[in-house]
Structure formats: C-alpha cells, structure tokens
Amino acid sequence: YDFTNCDFQKIEADYLRTISKDLITYMSGTKSTDFNNTVSCSNRPHCLTEIQSLTFNPTPRCASLAKEMFARKTKATLALWCPGYSETQINATQAMKKARKSKVTTNKCLEQVSQLLGLWRRFIRTLLKKQ
C-alpha cells in the first residue's frame, strides 16, 4: 500500500491521543535503554510503511502483535485516514490474525514494540519538519 495520500495530521493526532498510550502500556516494566533502535524511516509514507510491517507482519519470534490493542487502533487509524488502505490491507492482516494461536509477550515482542515507538516518534518528527 502506498501511504502517500494519508491524512498525516489526523494520524498523528490519533497516535498522540491513544495509540502511544497503549504502546507504552505494553512496554511497561522495561526501560527505553533496554533495546537499540535498528529500524528507521526517512519520510512520513516510509514511516507508515515500516509501522504497518512491524505491527502486522508476524516474525518467527513475535507472532502475536496484531491482536494487541495498539495494533487494532493502528489499523482503525490507517483505515480512517488512508483512503484505499482497508481494501488492500485489512483482509491480509485478518488472515494473519486467524493463523495465530497463543499470546505471549516475549522479549522479542518487547523489542519489536520498542522499534515501533521509535518509528512513531520519527513519523512525528518528520511531520514537524514539514510544518
């Protein structure tokens, strides 16, 4: 999906109001220094592409993030503010969700969410630069 036509201001507002809180709740008990940020993004559409991938694409050691509250809210936000997102992405992410069984917060998942927090912060910084 091409995130170029999204309403970035509205996505930022949703992130600051609600998604960020759920990400921080998920990370509770860990320190921001516990993980190194290895994933980066260069502009707003690129940041959303990386956020989408990290949130919904299962990895071998962390397969359960799409079920989390922050993921459901991310999906709703992208569906609302990125025209055409739902048609191209929702069915794919729902298929992934059905494929998963248990929900375990592994260290690898915490690391992935730490990367997500970094990507979202980067998204907001690139937004501020444009204004």
């Epitope: 949703d14 459901r72 709703a76 936000t77 569906a79 025209p83 048609e87």
Partner: antibody
Framework: QVQLVQSGAEVKKPGSSVKVSCKAS????????INWVRQAPGQGLEWMGV????????IYAEKFQGRVTITADESTSTAYMELSSLRSEDTAVYYC?????????????WGQGTLVTVSS | QSALTQPPSASGSPGQSVTISCSGS?????????VSWYQQHPGKAPKLMIY???KRPSGVPDRFSGSKSGNTASLTVSGLQAEDEADYYC???????????FGGGTKLTVL
Amino acid sequence: QVQLVQSGAEVKKPGSSVKVSCKASGFTFGSYGINWVRQAPGQGLEWMGVIVPLVGVTIYAEKFQGRVTITADESTSTAYMELSSLRSEDTAVYYCARGQEYFYWYFDLWGQGTLVTVSS
Amino acid sequence: QSALTQPPSASGSPGQSVTISCSGSSSDIGGYNRVSWYQQHPGKAPKLMIYDVSKRPSGVPDRFSGSKSGNTASLTVSGLQAEDEADYYCSSYAGTDTFILFGGGTKLTVL
C-alpha cells in the same frame, strides 16, 4: 442478536437541545463506526457524522459542525447524538447506523429511528 | 441540495430491468470504489443493498447489481418484483474531511 436500539420520540422547543441514544448489542461495539443519519419528512437521507469508539475519532458533516456532538460509552455499548440550537427544520427521523469494522463508509445495520419534532 | 444526483423517480413492469443512476464528481464517486446503495420502504429504516460499488451483502437477491463508470454509479434491478417498490439512495465515501455523501433518492415504482 445483532441490533441497534434507539431511544424514543422527542418533542422539543426551538433553541433547545436533544440527545438521542443508540444501544448496540451482539457485536464488538468499539471497532465499528457508529454513524448518525437524519431524514426530514418526505426528504432524503442526510449524513450527520460518525464516531469510532476504538480510537475516539469523530467526524462531522460540515453542515452540522458546531451544533452536533457525537459521543460513545464503550462500557454500555451506547452511542449518543446531541443536536443543539434546534429549529423547525431539524424535525426529522434520526437514525444511527453501523459502519463496518475498518470499512466505515457503508452501513450494514440500522437502528429503528427516533422521531424528533421541533415545535413551539 | 444533494451532493450526489439521482433521478427523482424510475419505473418498470414486473419482470423488467430498471437502472438508477447516481452522479457525483472525482472527489467522491470517481475517486474511490466506495459506493453503496440503500433500499428504504415507507416508514422503515434503510437497508444496505450494495457496497463497494458492486458487492452484495448476504441475503440480498442477485437481481440487484451495482456498477460504476467515471463519476457515475448505477444500480440495476433485474426481474422487477412488487416488493422492489421503494426509495433507493446512493452513497459515496468522499475523502477524510467530507467522509460520506448521500444522493437525493429515487422512488422506484413497479407498474
């Protein structure tokens, strides 16, 4: 049973406000969009706004901006539409309608409608 | 004044086909494949008949079909039946600010 049940008919004076409720059952309320659509007597459908409780987003039609407030209480699976500064032209049947989960733009479930009459 | 334009009335005899048009712009119908059609009988709530231009919800007869060309969407009812007599409304997604627009409605009469 999957349904939306709205509050009863109201008679209001011009200049006052009305608050209509819409109670959802049989589905996960928060993930869907709850829209409000009105229909004046003998007229067509008019979209007023939507709330997506999951992310706390509300979008209002420009015509109603500043006069309508849509809220939701996830604990009771109930959405509310409050319309202020009522005038006679606001006499209409007000419907709540469910926008599909993540596909918020089509309405696959409707409430029975609430008639609001504005008269002095 | 509706943002989407529909003919006020349409009619056909039982067994015939009738097509109702819905005209918009590149900002709504032409810009997205997010057109819906609703049927409304007198005194009843509307019912979703078509969504995403041409998809039918379960329970809706396959006599109802939708299509789109440019900025105009169409609803076709084939093999007209008496119970198809109702008002029909088109609706389109219109971007992240306007969000939803409705047509003015078309009264379908089965002769």
